[in-house]
């Protein structure tokens, strides 16, 4: 039975040109995390495999940095980066857990800075 839950930063906002950390955390399960996939809509951003390390999709390689941890740092944000992001945890023996983050990239400097994992 899958007992785990994914905690995410939920809805976050950041300024155009800035950076943001996308972070999820799997709790309430003893399952082993074998891999985390980061996706935006139907596009793969990155994969962090516990043994093989990181895969960064070529279309994002100049703007995505691995980490911290299993998270993903998105840099040089544009308004087009606004949207849903998914962390997909592959675990053994539970299976797959999915978390959702909504990122809004704001034009002005009045972006909220309250997000827990946001880079100053």
């Amino acid at each position: 039975m899958m007992t785990g839950t994914i905690e995410t930063t939920g809805n976050i906002s950041a300024e155009k040109g800035g950076s943001i950390i996308l972070q999820c955390h799997l709790s309430s399960t003893t399952a082993q995390v074998t891999q985390v996939n980061w996706e935006q809509q139907d596009q793969l951003l990155a994969i962090c495999n516990a043994d093989l390390g990181w895969h960064i999709s070529p279309s994002f390689k100049d703007r995505v940095a691995p980490g911290p941890g299993l998270g993903l740092t998105l840099q040089s944000l544009t308004v087009n980066d606004t949207g849903e992001y998914f962390c997909i945890y592959h675990t053994y023996p539970d299976g797959t857990y999915t978390g959702r983050i909504f990122l809004e990239v704001l034009e002005s400097s009045v972006a909220e800075h309250g997000a827990r994992f946001q880079i100053p």
């Epitope: 994969i47 093989l52 691995p66």
Partner: antibody
Framework: EVQLVQSGAEVKKPGSSVKVSCKAS????????IHWVRQAPGQGLEWMGG????????IYNQIFRGRVTITADKSTSTAYMELSSLRSEDTAVYYC????????????WGQGTTVTVSS | DIQMTQSPSSLSASVGDRVTITCRAS??????VVWYQQKPGKAPKLLIY???YRFTGVPSRFSGSGSGTDFTLTISSLQPEDFATYYC?????????FGGGTKVEIK
């Protein structure tokens, strides 16, 4: 120039083990994962597992159920794949391949090692 | 495990023909797909990754596309050196799996 040079052909008895080596050159060994892929005669490709020399992480295809062991000697930039409890169905060409940096794509391959399992 | 199904398993074509090979994943693999070319008695060679980026030195006549579960490798104008077997592979989740291959033969 990146090169992966594998050990020579082997003929083994059923129930025995084989250890294939893959010597890497032309790049920093610890910066790239090494994978092992096999191909039975006239068949397709089958991923066996990989080894990350950066932090000694090893991952296996569970279809081999503990029969495969992947190791490396970083001092000689050599990766090894050992397959135990051999059976006739393990007759195949075994390839090592390097993964590109920050990409799960195998960009350079060894020449292959033919392993024949026969009584 | 994710199954990768290639079609056709073989095809006959002439030099100059446009050739299309398809690969279907049994479940969502986003764009985590790679294509390899293999000639008889030789190791596979990386052609395309992610799934539309050509590897270094790969001619522009090779192109890849797709996302989700359906992927395509296209050779815009087949050359004599392109007669080979082509494999797709997914790396969305382990174990990594390959398609059964498509053999491109001379008509």
């Amino acid at each position: 120039e990146v090169q992966l040079v594998q050990s020579g052909a082997e003929v083994k008895k059923p129930g025995s083990s084989v250890k294939v080596s893959c010597k890497a050159s032309g790049y920093t060994f610890t910066e790239h994962v090494i994978h092992w892929v096999r191909q039975a005669p006239g068949q397709g490709l089958e991923w066996m597992g990989g080894f990350n020399p950066n932090h000694d992480g090893t991952i296996y295809n569970q279809i081999f159920r503990g029969r495969v062991t992947i190791t490396a000697d970083k001092s000689t930039s050599t990766a090894y794949m050992e397959l135990s409890s051999l059976r006739s169905e393990d007759t195949a060409v075994y390839y090592c391949a390097r993964a590109a940096k920050l990409l799960f794509a195998m960009d350079y391959w060894g020449q292959g090692t033919t392993v024949t399992v026969s009584s | 495990d994710i199954q990768m199904t290639q079609s056709p398993s073989s095809l006959s074509a002439s030099v100059g023909d446009r050739v299309t090979i398809t690969c279907r994943a049994s479940q969502h693999v986003s764009n985590a797909v790679v294509w390899y070319q293999q000639k008889p008695g030789k190791a596979p060679k990386l052609l395309i990754y992610s799934p539309s980026y050509r590897f270094t030195g790969v001619p522009s006549r090779f192109s890849g596309s797709g996302s989700g579960t359906d992927f395509t490798l296209t050779i815009s104008s087949l050359q004599p050196e392109d007669f080979a077997t082509y494999y797709c592979q997914q790396h969305y989740s382990t174990p990594w799996t390959f398609g059964g291959g498509t053999k491109v033969e001379i008509k």
